[in-house]
């Protein structure tokens, strides 16, 4: 049942990416939808040795990753605003989960290049649009109505069954033949009691 609901959720949430609408828009597929979440791909040139990559949602810093090297060429990777991220030799991927309408926004990859010099900042981005498919919307509209109707039918059914049961019971009580049989039983009981007293 749980997996069924999950697949329904996956089916309902679709992601559309509108790039090229902003300056410095990504010239690659920036958003990759999978497992009910989105992978936001922030690329950097292979030559870059040390950098800071920030994921911005509008103007807010959601995630960051900094890669530096020490005097012994030892690599240090830090995150001040931690997100699930993945580093490769030419990209940083940030992962966002449990998507809903509030995630729909402009997302930017803010790259600060420390090494090689000169220090440089580049901004690339795109719009992450989360929409529901027509069928999903129809389902979402009719599902509660259907459920409500089902509940109403169940209640009405219960009422009807109760009423029929009551009717059947009351009809057996008011049957003339039945009444005579009942009276006979009462009379017989009365007589036996009187006999007991007499004796």
């Amino acid at each position: 049942m749980k997996s069924g609901l999950w697949y329904f959720f996956l089916f309902c949430l679709r992601i559309k990416v509108l790039t090229g609408e902003i300056n410095g828009s990504a010239n690659y597929e920036m958003f990759i939808f999978h497992n009910g979440g989105v992978q936001i791909l922030c690329k950097y040139p292979d030559i870059v040795q040390q950098f800071k990559m920030q994921l911005l949602k509008g103007g807010q810093i959601l995630c960051d990753l900094t890669k530096t090297k020490g005097s012994g060429n030892t690599v240090s990777i830090k995150s001040l605003k931690f997100c699930h991220s993945q580093l490769s030799n030419n990209s940083v991927s940030f992962f966002l989960y449990n998507l809903d309408h509030s995630h729909a926004n402009y997302y930017f990859c803010n790259l600060s290049i420390f090494d090689p010099p000169p220090f440089k900042v580049t901004l690339t981005g795109g719009y992450l649009h989360i929409y529901e498919s027509q069928l999903c919307c129809q389902l979402k509209f009719w599902l509660p109505i259907g459920c409500a109707a089902f509940v109403v039918v169940c209640i009405l059914g219960c009422i009807l069954i109760c009423w029929l049961t009551k009717k059947k019971y009351s009809s057996s009580v008011h049957d003339p033949n039945g009444e005579y049989m009942f009276m006979r039983a009462v009379n017989t009981a009365k007589k036996s009691r009187l006999t007991d007293v007499t004796l």
Partner: antibody
Framework: EVQLVESGGGLVQPGGSLRLSCAAS????????MDWVRQAPGKGLVWVSN????????EYSPFVKGRFTISRDNAKNTLYLQMNSLRAEDTAVYYC??????????WGQGTLVTVSS | DIVMTQSPDSLAVSLGERATINCKSS??????????LTWYQQKPGQPPKLLIF???TRETGVPDRFSGSGSGTDFTLTISSLQAEDVAVYYC?????????FGPGTKVDIK
Amino acid sequence: EVQLVESGGGLVQPGGSLRLSCAASGFTFSDYWMDWVRQAPGKGLVWVSNIDEDGSITEYSPFVKGRFTISRDNAKNTLYLQMNSLRAEDTAVYYCTRWGRFGFDSWGQGTLVTVSS
Amino acid sequence: DIVMTQSPDSLAVSLGERATINCKSSQSLLSGSFNYLTWYQQKPGQPPKLLIFYASTRETGVPDRFSGSGSGTDFTLTISSLQAEDVAVYYCHHHYNAPPTFGPGTKVDIK
């Protein structure tokens, strides 16, 4: 302007301990790896130790490993070098340096450590 | 550990003349497209100063008479026209791996 000011040097007996400090200003201290480099009187430069931005990575020269400990306090913008079991060959001017991504781009004036009985 | 050697130990050059310092590493300092070699200048009574990084890139504010060249294991620092303020000891240094090491230095004087 980047400034690095070392302190804590002085005369110490062999086997003794000393703690050097380096007060940093003029830059975001927590964004940089920091190093200690020493220079014996009339000799060349020798790298001693380094530490990454938050202190989670430290490295040491084979000459001082196990005897010296590098640390930092980013809240105080200060770099430290705890020197134990000092030897005569540790006598040198100790420089605090900023590793500026691809070279030691800022140096303090140095503090002299003399190990002698 | 990588061993750095420099030659000559010292040299005296006339003002305006060219000074050339050589540095050799015991193994290649080339990684990708970068040579992990830097040059420092240390004037008497002063701390060292970064001149050249990645074997050939001048640090900001360093006069263009200073230039670096070489790749792999052999590197050169050239002062194209020696000035009085260039009197110093020059060190090469690698940061290819840990521990980073310095060359023994080359002292440059005016003839």
